[in-house]
């Protein structure tokens, strides 16, 4: 504790200018005071001034009024500081002395003489109100008042309660008259060191380090930290718990990055072709006659079907074609010959057979040659017989189509649907996508093939400790423990002081 006993001297009267021994002062009693403050004694005795002592300079001669003075020599009220708990009781001895010597330091002068003394014993509570008193004896009268107040930063009825107002990391408060803390606006707690967060800030998902703030814990966002953040890899999805990826309509896959409506979103098929949401790229274009290419972007040449026979060359025209025939041939497709076997029309060892009584002929070609005159080496791949990007390969007299993944058939014309095997359990909807089938599961099921019944999820075993809330996460094997204040760990198994709850993915 710490406080000050204050004594205000008001008036001293010694009309006859007499000393205590009956002698008179010459030329008058030049008066100073000695004050001794000590613990309560029923009978005042000499001895140390246990609570403190103080002397004044000469304040006047014989009778005088003592003015208040706040500093320097002759300060009034007199100050007797103490640094202990005020006991509520005291003994006070006030002595008036005459000095023939120095006005300012009369204590040091020889020949000082006692004029009078008073002794006060009693109780005194700490407070701002002055207690006024007057003491008389046969020769003198003294008017005075006194009180006990606490030093700065000390409070309470015995000045034992220390309170220093502060506004820093350790607290934000002012001091009440009784020494209790009064928190500054926006702060709370025993030491006013806990900020009051933004009104409505989510109790578990948010916290604050200063008033009217709402800082979100990992996985949460927004003004009040009541919106979750989707998974890092999520593209076209949302969440109902942190790090989830629940696909927007028309999107599939673990990270909602596979377009289930590619045809609608991108219209990739050209020239009036039909688009279907299947195939290795998420769509397939079925071309109208006369068009080809992955997106049906290529118009087929009218000559593409090789309509000109007997070595005739084909020329594209606006809506048809024209055959330029070699010598000896005529007709729209150079199908008529003016030659006979006598003209040796068969090349590459072909045998000539006369027809129509020698007016025409037919060539029988050896293996690997073809054409009306056996003029063409057989390349069974020239007609691009392999569909859907299949690779044509000549194998002697025959050819084979090497199909891309997802296609089959002699000409790779058949699309193998991953969904044909009905891989989705429990009524899941199957979508053929580039990396295999994707299942959209009905409510209550999850997993790549909708094979997991959510009611028997990872939370069923109660993996979270200490009253934590359990959520299922991105896959059936994942769960999230949202820890209560004071616990951390993937299962909220570790007690800890700070920081409070974080969601953990196990």
């Amino acid at each position: 504790g710490s406080g000050i006993f204050q004594l205000r001297l008001q008036e001293f009267v010694n009309q006859r200018g007499m000393l205590a021994n009956g002698q008179s002062c010459e030329p008058g009693c030049r008066t100073f005071f000695r004050i001794c403050l000590k613990h309560f004694q029923a009978t005042f005795s000499e001895g140390p001034c246990t609570f403190g002592n103080v002397s004044t300079p000469v304040l006047g001669t014989n009778s005088f009024v003592v003015r208040d003075k706040n500093s320097g020599s002759g300060r009034n009220p007199l100050q007797l500081p103490f640094n202990f708990t005020w006991p509520g009781t005291f003994s006070l001895n006030i002595q008036a002395w005459h000095t023939p010597g120095d006005d300012l330091r009369p204590e040091t002068s020889p020949g000082n003489s006692l004029i009078s003394q008073i002794i006060i014993q009693g109780s005194l509570a700490v407070g701002k109100i002055w207690r006024t008193d007057e003491q008389n004896d046969t020769l003198t009268r003294l008017s005075y008042s006194y009180r006990v107040i606490c030093s700065d930063n000390y409070y309470g009825e015995s000045c034992s309660r220390l309170c220093k107002k502060r506004d820093d990391h350790f607290g934000h408060y002012e001091c009440q008259p009784d020494g209790s803390l009064s928190c500054l606006p926006g702060w709370t707690g025993k030491y006013c060191d806990q900020p009051i967060c933004l009104s409505g800030c989510h109790e578990q998902n948010g916290y604050c380090s200063k008033p009217d703030e709402c800082i979100c814990r990992p996985g949460w966002q927004g003004r009040l930290c009541n919106e979750c953040i989707p998974h890092n890899g999520c593209r076209h999805g949302t969440c109902s718990i942190p790090w989830q990826c629940a696909c927007d309509e028309g999107w599939g896959g673990l990270f909602c990055d596979q377009d289930l409506n590619y045809c609608t979103h991108h219209s990739p098929c050209k020239n009036g072709s039909t688009c279907s949401n299947s195939g290795p790229k998420g769509y397939t274009c079925t071309c109208l006659p006369g068009y080809t290419g992955e997106h049906c972007e290529l118009g087929l040449s009218k000559c593409a079907s090789n309509p000109c026979r007997n070595g005739g060359s084909c020329k594209d025209q606006e809506n048809s074609y024209h055959c330029l025939c070699p010598p000896g041939y005529y007709g729209q497709h150079c199908e008529h010959s003016t030659l006979t076997c006598a003209d040796s029309p068969c090349f590459n060892g072909g045998s000539c057979r006369e027809r129509n009584q020698g007016s025409s002929y037919a060539c029988e070609c050896p293996p690997n040659f073809t054409g009306s005159n056996c003029e063409k080496k057989v390349d069974r791949c020239t007609s691009n017989p392999c569909a859907n990007g299949g690779q044509c390969q000549n194998r002697g007299p025959s050819r084979t189509c090497r199909c891309r993944p997802g296609f089959t058939g002699t000409h790779c014309e058949l699309h193998i649907s991953d969904c044909a095997r009905s891989p989705c359990a429990h009524g899941g909807t199957c979508h053929d996508l580039e990396n295999g089938p994707v299942c959209t599961c009905p409510a209550g099921f999850s997993g790549r093939r909708c094979e997991v019944r959510i009611t028997h999820d990872a939370c069923a075993s109660g993996p979270c400790f200490n009253g934590a809330t359990c959520y299922t996460g991105l896959s059936p094997n994942n769960f999230v423990c949202n820890c209560p204040y004071g616990f951390v760990g993937s299962r909220c198994e570790f007690p800890v002081g700070l920081p409070p709850s974080f969601p953990w993915v196990a």
Partner: antibody, heavy 118, light 107 residues
């Protein structure tokens, strides 16, 4: 494919203003919180600001608070950073990133250079 | 603010080497740590989040581990394309803070 493309950087005098933009594609922009992160020449990375997805709640770093504001337009798939009262120490490459102040920054733009000099 | 201290600041290694980079937080960050790779003139790329989860498309030679205040990024067998600067980042406490970076150079 997720793409973030920043624009609006350039040379500006101290005390001047600049507005950076970030065009997003390849994901549903309105579903995700977004941030700005900067990198002074030859230095490390510093988080600048974040904005939530649906209520567009802005959180600004102390070093730029009162001078910079972050905003978004979900209809335009765009993120913005309004920079006022620019100082020499704001000189940096500013990156637009998908993520919040309490999450990893999963995707980043190529960056736009802001130079504050007289 | 939480201080993130990476060590070493720079590192020379050869193709095929096993490399370890450490990141220390000034207080416990509860596994909320990410690692990024940045090549000169390019933007950072997320490698690892939640201390040990590999980001989409990141080769399996990268791995992360740690608990409490200390975290580690390991590259099991260095490839030519791995020479870059690596940053760690904590996202437990506001504001998020990054390490000063570790420059991985060819020996």
């Amino acid at each position: 494919e997720v793409q973030l493309v920043e624009s609006g950087g350039g040379l500006v005098q101290p005390g001047g203003s600049l507005r950076l933009s970030c065009a997003a594609s390849g994901f549903t922009f309105g579903n995700f919180p977004m941030s700005w992160v900067r990198q002074a020449p030859g230095k490390g990375l510093e988080w600048v600001a974040s904005i939530s997805s649906s209520d567009s709640w802005a959180t600004i770093g102390d070093s730029v608070k009162g001078r910079f504001t972050i905003s978004r337009d979900n209809a335009k798939n765009s993120l913005y950073l309004q920079m006022n009262s620019l100082r020499a120490e704001d000189t940096a490459v500013y990156y637009c990133a998908r993520g919040y102040y309490n999450s990893p920054f999963a995707f980043w733009g190529q960056g736009t250079l802001v130079t504050v000099s007289s | 603010d939480i201080q993130m201290t990476q060590s070493p600041s720079s590192l020379s290694a050869s193709v095929g080497d096993r490399v370890t980079i450490t990141c220390r937080a000034s207080q416990e960050i509860y596994r909320n740590l990410a690692w990024y790779q940045q090549k000169p003139g390019k933007s950072p790329k997320l490698l690892i989040f939640d201390t040990s989860v590999l980001a989409d498309g990141v080769p399996s030679r990268f791995s992360g581990s740690g608990s409490g205040t200390d975290s580690t990024l390991t590259i099991s067998s260095l490839q030519p394309e791995d020479f870059a600067t690596y940053y760690c980042q904590q996202y437990t406490y506001y504001p998020p803070t990054f390490g000063q970076g570790t420059k991985l150079e060819i020996k």
